[in-house]
C-alpha cells in the first residue's frame, strides 16, 4: 500500500484551511479521549479512478468521498483519519486531514475527497473514514467503512494500467488445445514479443472430480526474435488412465517485468460426451 505522488496532497477548500498528514493509524484521541466528539461521516463513496504518476505510469487509485452531517457536532470536528486496510495481508495505510480552521455551516453540505491511495488489481480493501477526535470508549461510533474490491487484470480498463502491463496483461496467447489419437494433446499458443521461456502445466482430472489424476510440466525455450507473435505448437503425451479425461492446460510466461509472477492463461478440455449405452438386446428370444 502506498500513496500516489505524495507531494500533491491537498484538502483545503473555500472556507476551510486543511492539511494532509501521514498518520500512524492511531490518533491521539484514542489515548486521550475528548468529552465532545463529532458525528460520523455521511454517504461514504468509494470509486475506482486511474491516475498518472509524474513518470507517466498509470495506476488504479481508490477515490474516497464523503459528506458531513448537518448537525452542530461540526463545531467539534478537528479533522478526519482515512484508513485503507488490504484484507489479504492486513497491511494498513492511513492519512489524516487536519483542519487548521473551525468549520462553519454554510449554504451547501461540506464534502471531502481523497484520491491518492494506490490499489492493486484483484485485491480487496476495507476503506474507513473516521472523524476526529474519535469517540470516548462507550460513545457512538463516528466512522464509516466499506469493503472495496478492485477488478483483476482481465478487466478491459485495468489491463492497460502499469501494474497489469508489468505482469503481462497485454499478452493474449489465444490458446487452443485439441485431443489427438494415442493419448496426446496438441497445445498451440501465440508467443509474446520477448525472448523469454514459457512453461506449460498440464493437470488432468477424472470426469466429475477435482483431485488430479495426472500432472505434467513442459518447458518451452525462449523464442528467437523472428518467432515473436508466431504460434508455438507442442504435443503432450497423456497418461493412459481410463477416465482421466478432463485436461487443464496452463501457460506460464517468464517475462522480464514479472519473472515468475506473471499472469497465467489457461484452457480446459472437457471429457468426451458418453453416449447412453442401451441395454443389450439378445439375438434370439427363448420361446418358453
Amino acid at each position: 500500500l502506498r500513496l500516489l505522488d505524495h507531494r500533491a496532497l491537498v484538502c483545503s477548500q473555500p472556507g476551510l484551511n486543511c492539511t494532509v498528514k501521514n498518520s500512524t493509524c492511531l490518533d491521539d484521541s484514542w489515548i486521550h479521549p475528548r468529552n465532545l466528539t463529532p458525528s460520523s461521516p455521511k454517504d461514504l463513496q468509494i470509486q475506482l479512478h486511474f491516475a498518472h504518476t509524474q513518470q507517466g505510469d498509470l495506476f488504479p487509485v481508490a477515490h474516497i468521498e464523503w459528506t458531513l452531517q448537518t448537525d452542530a457536532s461540526i463545531l467539534y470536528l478537528e479533522g478526519a483519519e482515512l484508513s485503507v486496510l488490504q484484507l489479504n495481508t492486513n497491511e494498513r495505510l492511513c492519512v489524516r486531514f487536519e483542519f487548521l480552521s473551525k468549520l462553519r455551516h454554510h449554504h451547501r453540505r461540506w464534502r471531502f475527497t481523497f484520491s491518492h491511495f494506490v490499489v492493486d488489481p484483484d485485491q480487496e480493501y476495507e476503506v474507513t473514514v473516521h472523524h476526529l477526535p474519535k469517540p470516548i470508549p462507550d460513545g457512538d461510533p463516528n466512522h464509516q467503512s466499506k469493503n472495496f474490491l478492485v477488478p483483476d487484470c482481465e478487466h478491459a480498463r485495468m489491463k492497460v494500467t502499469t501494474p497489469c502491463m508489468s505482469s503481462g496483461s497485454l499478452w493474449d496467447p489465444n490458446i487452443t488445445v485439441e485431443t489427438l489419437e494415442a493419448h496426446q494433446l496438441r497445445v498451440s499458443f501465440t508467443l509474446w514479443n520477448e525472448s523469454t521461456h514459457y512453461q506449460i502445466l498440464l493437470t488432468s482430472f477424472p470426469h466429475m472430480e477435482n483431485h488430479s489424476c495426472f500432472e505434467h510440466m513442459h518447458h518451452i525455450p525462449a523464442p528467437r526474435p523472428e518467432e515473436f507473435h508466431q504460434r508455438s505448437n507442442v504435443t503432450l503425451t497423456l497418461r493412459n488412465l481410463k477416465g482421466c479425461c478432463r485436461h487443464q492446460v496452463q501457460i506460464q510466461p517468464f517475462f522480464s517485468s514479472c519473472l515468475n509472477d506473471c499472469l497465467r492463461h489457461s484452457a480446459t478440455v472437457s471429457c468426451p460426451e458418453m453416449p447412453d449405452t442401451p441395454e443389450p438386446i439378445p439375438d434370439y428370444m427363448p420361446l418358453w
Epitope: 461514504l44 463513496q45 468509494i46 470509486q47 475506482l48 481508490a62 477515490h63 466499506k146 480498463r157 485495468m158
Partner: nanobody
Framework: QVQLVESGGGLVQPGRSLRLSCAAS????????MHWVRQAPGKGLEWVSG????????DYADSVKGRFTISRDNAKNSLYLQMNSLRSEDTALYYC????????????????????WGQGTMVTVSS
C-alpha cells in the same frame, strides 16, 4: 443514456420461485459490478445481492442467503435474480442498480445514494 429495465415480478405463493431480469443499455455493461436492492412497502431500501463484472464474486444479504442466486450474462447485457423458497417478507419492489465506478463493494454498493437504477419490478409473496 444509461437505462435499466427490470422485469419478472408478480404475485407468487410462499415457497415458490421467481426469476427477475434486468436489461441494461447505454453503458459498457461488462465493465461494471451490479446489485439488486429492494424496498418493502413503507420501508427503506435494503441491499439484496451484488455481483462483480465477471461474476467472479457474488454476495448476499443474510436474509436471502441460500435462497436467492444472482447471475449475469454479459453477452446479453442482462442481470438476473433467481428467487427460491419465497417468503412473505420478500414482498417488495426490486431494483437493479449499476455501480458508479469499476470497483465492487461487499454488502452494499460503493456509492450511496444509489447511482443508476431502474423503475423496479414488484414481487408480492402471498397465499
Amino acid at each position: 443514456q444509461v437505462q435499466l429495465v427490470e422485469s419478472g415480478g408478480g404475485l407468487v405463493q410462499p415457497g415458490r420461485s421467481l426469476r427477475l431480469s434486468c436489461a441494461a443499455s447505454g453503458f459498457s455493461f461488462d465493465d461494471y459490478a451490479m446489485h439488486w436492492v429492494r424496498q418493502a412497502p413503507g420501508k427503506g431500501l435494503e441491499w439484496v445481492s451484488g455481483i462483480t463484472w465477471n461474476s467472479g464474486r457474488k454476495d448476499y444479504a443474510d436474509s436471502v442467503k441460500g435462497r436467492f442466486t444472482i447471475s449475469r450474462d454479459n453477452a446479453k447485457n442482462s442481470l438476473y435474480l433467481q428467487m427460491n423458497s419465497l417468503r412473505s417478507e420478500d414482498t417488495a419492489l426490486y431494483y437493479c442498480v449499476k455501480e458508479r465506478s469499476l470497483g465492487y463493494c461487499r454488502g452494499g454498493t460503493c456509492s450511496e445514494p444509489f447511482h443508476i437504477w431502474g423503475q423496479g419490478t414488484m414481487v408480492t409473496v402471498s397465499s
